[in-house]
């Protein structure tokens, strides 16, 4: 089956959600771990990640179609300390599959706003820190 990983971001007020989505077949969930790393070019692993999610097979989902599992990492207030390069990754202990998402970046600007760049689903998100709006 085709397994892939995508990265996305959303804003709710001052909160920034970084989302790692893994698309996989239902039976492939067991033993899969999804994780998010910061500033790690080559050694992104569950052990070095900011957050990880171990997937479980959901018996309630019927059929053998593709399903998605999401890891959400929420930053309540983005600060200059959050500037850096992030990457969503996943690996399966059963099959040995390793997935590495595209690198994306948070840049905190001198004006007190921040931008998220490098996301494949919406190439460029710009957030105003004070008003909490998406432009």
């Amino acid at each position: 089956g085709c397994i892939n990983i995508t990265s996305s971001a959303s804003q709710e007020g001052t909160r920034l959600n970084l989302i790692c989505t893994v698309w996989h077949k239902k039976e492939e969930a067991e033993g899969f771990v999804v994780f998010l790393c910061k500033d790690r070019s080559g050694d992104c692993s569950p052990e070095t990640s900011l957050k990880q999610l171990r997937l479980k097979r959901d018996p309630g989902i019927d059929g053998v179609g593709e399903i998605s599992s999401q890891l959400m990492f929420t930053i309540s207030q983005v600060t200059p300390l959050h500037s850096g390069t992030y990457q969503c990754c996943a690996r399966s202990q059963k099959s040995g599959i390793r997935l590495q998402g595209h690198f994306f970046s948070i840049l905190f600007t001198e004006t007190g706003n921040y931008t998220v760049t490098g996301l494949k689903q919406r190439q460029h998100l710009e957030f105003s820190h004070n008003e909490g709006t998406l432009s």
Epitope: G13, T14, K38, D39, E47, T48, S49, L50, F73, T74, I75, S76, Q77, T79, P80, L81, S83, G84, G112, H129
Partner: antibody
């Protein structure tokens, strides 16, 4: 168990230098931004400086800018505070603290180290 | 720079009493954090993001507020709650600021 152990505190004369260290254990040090927070005797808390997880970005309160330098060595799980041109108003207990990644709270604190600046 | 002021500066409460400590900001802030500090000890995070209790904090504590006014409340004061409480916020560019503290004593 997260542990932060500060060292390097001393009695120094005004204008002199001092370097504080904070040895960290019990967590993936290179993932976390770190900070120094100080407390003058019988006074309140005052943020001094912060450094990003990789060490590339650092930030200071106005009163220490140009005099203090925060740094870190991720290979040694240690952060530092180089304090130059010390003044009597820098006299305080200096705490090493971790930045919570998802919030703006300081979630782990060391026991602190005393710095006294006096002639 | 956003300045935080706390009231009262010091207070004494009897066991079982309801206690409220207030923190006011000179401009609107998004969240307020609270720390507890006992003599000779380092501060401990007590309430974060305005209303979330830190691990191990008894549920007699609560936090609330928005904009420029925030508070920490103890529903039934106990002897172990005697300490100094500090509020703290983040904003750009002044970064991290603390309130002057409220010293809470037990009768």
């Amino acid at each position: 168990e997260v542990q932060l152990v500060e060292s390097g505190g001393d009695l120094v004369q005004p204008g002199r230098s001092l370097k504080l260290s904070c040895a960290a254990s019990g967590f993936t040090f290179s993932n976390y931004a770190m900070a120094w927070v100080r407390q003058a005797p019988t006074k309140g808390l005052e943020w001094v400086a912060s450094i990003s997880n990789g060490g590339g970005n650092s930030f200071y309160r106005d009163s220490v800018k140009g005099r203090f330098t925060i740094s870190r060595d991720n290979a040694k799980n240690t952060q530092y505070l180089q304090m130059d041109s010390l003044r009597s108003e820098d006299t305080a207990t200096y705490y090493c603290a971790t930045h919570n990644y998802e919030s703006t709270v300081f979630d782990y604190w060391g026991r602190g180290v005393m710095v006294t600046v006096s002639s | 720079e956003i300045v935080l002021t706390q009231s009262p500066t010091t207070m004494t409460a009897s066991p079982g009493e309801k206690v409220t400590i207030t923190c006011r900001a000179s401009s609107s802030v998004s969240y307020m954090h609270w720390y507890q500090q006992k003599p000779g000890a380092s501060p401990k995070p007590w309430i974060y993001e305005t209303s979330k209790l830190a691990s191990g904090v008894p549920d007699r504590f609560s936090g609330s507020g928005s904009g420029t006014s925030y508070s920490l409340t103890i529903n039934n004061m106990e002897a172990e709650d005697a300490a100094t409480y500090y509020c703290q916020q983040w904003n750009y560019p002044s970064m991290y600021t603390f309130g002057p503290g409220t010293k809470l004593e037990i009768k």
